[in-house]
């Protein structure tokens, strides 16, 4: 789980070991702050759970791509 020591900086110290079904993912945000020990992605699930994941893993990249496509609006 993400850990906010000094708000507003949230850091991840451990990553989930399992793939999470993309059907259960609602959104994500990237953690790139130099105040954090590692870069991370925090997924928010449909039941509002937040999960730290490793941005180097393919399933994490696929999930972000999937969520990006879902939120894209048609260009006018």
């Amino acid at each position: 789980q993400p850990d906010a020591i000094n708000a507003p900086v949230t850091c991840c110290y451990n990553f989930t070991n399992r793939k999470i079904s993309v059907q259960r993912l609602a959104s994500y945000r990237r953690i790139t702050s130099s105040k954090c020990p590692k870069e991370a992605v925090i997924f928010k699930t449909i039941v509002a759970k937040e999960i730290c994941a490793d941005p180097k893993q393919k399933w994490v990249q696929d999930s972000m791509d999937h969520l990006d496509k879902q939120t894209q609006t048609p260009k006018t």
Partner: antibody, heavy 119, light 113 residues
Framework: QVQLVQSGAEVKKPGASVKVSCKVS????????MHWVRQAPGKGLEWMGG????????IYAQKFQGRVTMTEDTSTDTAFMELSSLRSEDTAVYYC????????????WGQGTLVTVSS | DIVMTQSPDSLAVSLGERATINCKSS????????????LVWYQQKPGQPPKVLIY???IRESGVPDRFSGSGSGTDFTLTISSLQAEDVAVYYC?????????FGQGTKVEIK
């Protein structure tokens, strides 16, 4: 494509324990979240528990808490479900079930293992 | 826990006629941000494991005949077989996969009249 192959039928005496296995192929077990569902003769489907990646832990249905243990051997891609203190009402077909990365429901099922509890 | 209740427990329908099964959840299984209900319908034939027919309440699984359709949102759902075939004789279950513990309806047995 995920394939799940379960161990064979078992006959147990009341009070004993049973351990059912579920071998995964097509994926590695560590990529999946394995669950167990049982079905008593002529009855409906009953979720017993499984791995919840959102909490990063195995969760159990309240009914089976303290009596069931679900484990994994990732070196052989095999999941196990052990049920202790068996009683006649535990006579059922036990299924392992999982989903792939793209689905959140139980897309893949083992063939089922019949456990008969009888004195 | 979310309780799933199906009705009827069984129904007998003539070949070629419509079969309708209802499923009600005790809490909403709708994720409002994307308007998707996390409900799946399974078909189970004797001696076989369940097979997915419909997910997200209304999306037909690949390879499932189009006589099967799902509808509903939130707490009330319906599985419809538009023209019953002999091979559709089975027990049908709804299940919510919105939140753990995952819960099933008690099942509806469909037979030929």
């Amino acid at each position: 494509q995920v394939q799940l192959v379960q161990s064979g039928a078992e006959v147990k005496k009341p009070g004993a324990s049973v351990k059912v296995s579920c071998k995964v192929s097509g994926y590695t077990l560590s990529e999946l979240s394995m669950h167990w569902v049982r079905q008593a003769p002529g009855k409906g489907l009953e979720w017993m528990g499984g791995f919840d990646p959102e909490d990063d832990e195995t969760i159990y249905a309240q009914k089976f808490q303290g009596r069931v243990t679900m484990t994994e051997d990732t070196s052989t891609d095999t999941a196990f479900m052990e049920l202790s203190s068996l009683r006649s009402e535990d006579t059922a077909v036990y299924y392992c079930a999982t989903h792939d990365f793209w689905s959140g429901y139980f897309h893949y099922w083992g063939q089922g293992t019949l456990v008969t509890v009888s004195s | 826990d979310i309780v799933m209740t199906q009705s009827p427990d069984s129904l007998a329908v003539s070949l070629g006629e419509r079969a309708t099964i209802n499923c009600k959840s005790s809490q909403s299984v709708l994720y409002s941000s994307d308007n998707k209900s996390y409900l799946v319908w399974y078909q189970q034939k004797p001696g076989q494991p369940p097979k997915v027919l419909i997910y997200w309440a209304s999306i037909r699984e690949s390879g499932v005949p189009d006589r099967f359709s799902g509808s509903g949102s939130g707490t009330d759902f319906t599985l419809t077989i538009s023209s019953l075939q002999a091979e559709d004789v089975a027990v049908y279950y709804c299940q919510q996969y919105y939140t753990s513990p995952w819960t099933f309806g008690q099942g509806t047995k469909v037979e030929i009249k």
